[in-house]
Interface confidence: medium
């Protein structure tokens, strides 16, 4: 367990020309206040997945009326950190995002607005204990100054807060096996505590009080044996009894959401939605009010003046949650027809169309027999969009330039041999069969299945195909 | 002559991820946009997504929940699909397939690779 | 999602005569189905799409047909390498669904 700390410094214009208009005037006096949202890993999808690691909200600012004619100044800040409390051990890779938001105090109704003035997101690598970073992003013709650091909650150190420090017991040593804790060399590496009785064999744990199987064994003690055999259902009634290989508790399982939360499964954890008031990882932030700004991106929020009364989230399109935390994935209601492929500009949906088809949804089909011609007599069909020419016999190719050989697909059934002819093939049937394609067996009493050979045609003579 | 060469069969554990790849020659691969499809033993042909080389936009069947990522490297003309938290229902052949860019959306398919998921 | 159903799941035909699946899907497809043919050792081949255009290289006793929700594929005199299994599939819109395949057999 540990804290991420955050530290903005300055909020103002950006280097260059361009200088933006201070956010608040006399006429709108407004403050700032920062929200941040931190994510696990090297995530591509800062801005539309839940904020895993954690969230936070800074205090308001102080008060700031612009001066008549002045430029935008760095904004006066609120005080303190902005800290992130993370229960589990710190990833050692984050994904970020710092929300610049504006609180104008004019005399709207119904009280103060929120506005998003600028977000800004980022990858980093940060070890736990380590000395503060510093921070430099742009966002438009804004420029956020801020540092940063992960530190750990005692009794957990080490660059992930994995390891565990108790004071020594003995004035000079640690006990067998465990190394000073450094820096807190006054203190000894704590041995884990798994869960009671978790096999010493075949279980390990990474947090105190768990138990987690090594492969092969199974059990909340990691005492069964698993055998692929036998099992009665995907998370059949009993591992502990069948031996069966089940899948491991679900991470649903037990549900981590509180306060009337519904859990959902992802590939790699899992999501809680939040009913409205609460919010967090496991819906455990509560007490929230519209004077907390719990709406993400953009959202506009309403009632929830006291703690007591729920705030409504009204998300801007493209957004949706209680808290507009998510990002509508407007292209999985695959909007796009004949295999577009949809492209989601935020302010609209785009639809990439394959070759023949058109329309903001590729819904028409282009004729692309339009202004084409196919030669030696040859006649275009319109095949969604492939220009097809259907040609006459003894040509072939695209646009039946092409003499064909009508041999070529091996018309002559049952062994017949096939001969090109100037209109068109001729099969030499096989003994036995007949026809224009020697499709037809010819009965041993000489008579035909079907229909009779042409007068004048002997069965076994070529037959001319026309 | 088009070709699609894919990777060797794999073997892999519950959990696990597995990336497949697919080699193009005969062609211009970033004109052909190009497909995914797996067949589960005994089971039909299931379509998991598609790729356009030229700027790796994808589309990808929600049935996969986010498992499934298509990738391309142009400067080897090789397409990638990467599926992770593997399951046994995952046990399956997985076929690349060339867009023909008309309607016809695979004119030409990989031979197959074989993933088996088991622990 | 659009779901397709194949009839028959095998069919066994003499040398030379018709061979005839169908293919239905839950919901309108217009034109937009295409036909597969799977061999063992071999990579799939295209045999039909756009419900009736026939690939290019594929031999004319194939023959498709139908519009909207229900469509044919016709064998019109079997050979011995027309053994296979054939797929039906939608491309009039992602995710694109396959039948469950239909085996032809020589009888």
């Known amino acids: 367990a540990g804290v991420f700390e955050l530290q903005i410094h300055s909020f103002g214009p950006g280097p260059g020309p361009g200088a933006p208009r201070s956010p608040c005037s006399a006429r709108l006096p407004c403050r700032l206040f920062f929200r941040v949202c931190l994510k696990p890993g090297l995530s591509e999808e800062a801005a539309e997945s839940p904020c895993a690691l954690g969230a936070a909200l800074s205090a308001r600012g102080p008060v700031y009326t612009e001066q008549p004619g002045a430029p935008a100044p760095d904004l006066p800040l609120p005080d303190g950190l902005l800290q992130v409390p993370f229960r589990d051990a710190w990833p050692g890779t984050f994904s970020f995002i710092i929300e610049t938001w504006r609180e104008e105090l004019g005399d709207q109704i119904g009280g103060p607005a929120w506005s998003l003035l600028a977000r800004v997101a980022g990858r980093r690598r940060l070890a736990a204990g380590g000395p503060w970073a510093r921070d430099i992003q742009r966002a438009g013709a804004w420029e956020l100054r801020f540092s940063y650091r992960a530190r750990c909650e005692p009794p957990a150190v080490g660059t992930a807060c994995t390891r565990l420090c108790r004071p020594r017991s003995a004035p000079s040593r640690c006990g067998p096996g465990l190394r000073p804790c450094a820096p807190l060399e006054d203190e000894c590496e704590a041995p884990l505590v798994c869960r009671a009785g978790c096999s010493p064999e075949h279980g390990f744990c990474e947090q105190p009080g768990e138990c987690r199987c090594l492969e092969g064994w199974t059990g909340p003690l990691c005492t069964v044996p698993v055998s692929t055999s036998s099992c009665l259902s995907p998370r059949g009634p009993s591992s502990a009894t069948t031996g069966c290989l089940v899948p491991g508790p679900g991470p649903c399982d037990g549900n981590p959401c509180a306060n009337g939360g519904s859990c959902s499964e992802t590939p790699r954890s899992f999501e809680c939605t939040c009913p409205r008031g609460f919010y967090g990882l496991r819906c455990e932030v509560s007490g929230v009010t519209c004077a907390d700004g719990p709406c993400f991106n953009g959202g506009l929020c309403v009632g929830g003046a006291d703690p007591d009364s729920a705030y409504i989230c009204h998300c801007p399109p493209g957004f949706q949650g209680s808290n507009c935390e998510k990002r509508v994935d407007r292209c999985s209601l695959q909007p796009c027809r004949n295999g577009g492929l949809c492209l989601d500009l935020g302010h609209a949906l785009r639809c990439r169309c394959r070759a023949g088809f058109a329309g903001p949804r590729c819904e028409h089909d282009l004729d692309d027999c339009a202004g084409r011609a196919c030669a030696n007599g040859g006649t275009c069909v319109e095949g969604g969009g492939a220009h097809r020419c259907s040609c006459a016999l003894g040509f072939g190719g695209r646009d039946c330039r092409e003499r064909a050989d009508p041999c070529a697909a091996r018309p002559c059934a049952h062994g017949g041999r096939c001969y090109a002819h100037f209109s068109g093939l001729v099969c030499a049937c096989a003994p036995g069969y007949m026809g224009a394609r020697c499709e037809f067996p010819v009965h041993p009493d000489g008579a035909s299945a079907l229909p009779a050979a042409p007068p004048g045609l002997r069965p076994g003579d070529p037959q001319r195909y026309l | 002559e088009v070709q699609l060469v894919q990777s060797g069969a794999e073997v892999k554990k519950p959990g696990a991820s597995v990336k497949v790849s697919c080699k193009a020659s005969?062609?211009?691969?970033?004109?052909?946009?190009m497909h995914w499809v797996r067949q589960a033993p005994g089971q039909r042909l299931e379509w998991m997504g598609v790729?356009?080389?030229?700027?790796?936009?994808?589309n990808y069947n929600q049935e996969f929940k986010g498992r499934v990522t298509i990738t391309v490297d142009t400067s080897a003309s090789t397409a990638y699909m990467e599926l992770s938290s593997l399951r046994s229902e995952d046990t399956a052949v997985y076929y690349c397939?060339?867009?023909?860019?008309?309607?016809?959306?695979?004119?030409?398919w990989g031979q197959g690779t074989t993933v088996t998921v088991s622990s | 999602d659009i779901v397709m159903t194949q009839s028959p799941d095998s069919l066994a035909v003499s040398l030379g005569e018709r061979a005839t699946i169908n293919c239905r899907a839950t919901?309108?497809?217009?034109?937009?189905l295409a036909w597969y043919q799977q061999k063992p050792g071999q990579t799939n081949k295209l045999l039909i799409f756009?419900?009736?255009t026939l690939q290019s290289g594929v031999p004319d006793r194939f023959s498709g047909s139908g519009s909207g929700t229900d469509f044919t594929l016709t064998i019109s005199s079997l050979q011995a390498e027309d053994v296979a299994v054939y797929y039906c599939?939608?491309?009039?819109?992602?995710?694109?669904?396959f039948g469950g395949g239909t085996k032809v057999e020589i009888k």
């Open positions: 397939a060339r867009d023909s860019t008309v309607v016809a959306p695979m004119d030409y």
């Open positions: 005969g062609y211009t691969f970033t004109s052909y946009w």
């Open positions: 790729i356009d080389p030229s700027d790796s936009l994808a």
């Open positions: 919901k309108s497809i217009s034109k937009y």
């Open positions: 756009s419900g009736s």
């Open positions: 599939q939608q491309h009039h819109e992602y995710p694109y669904t």
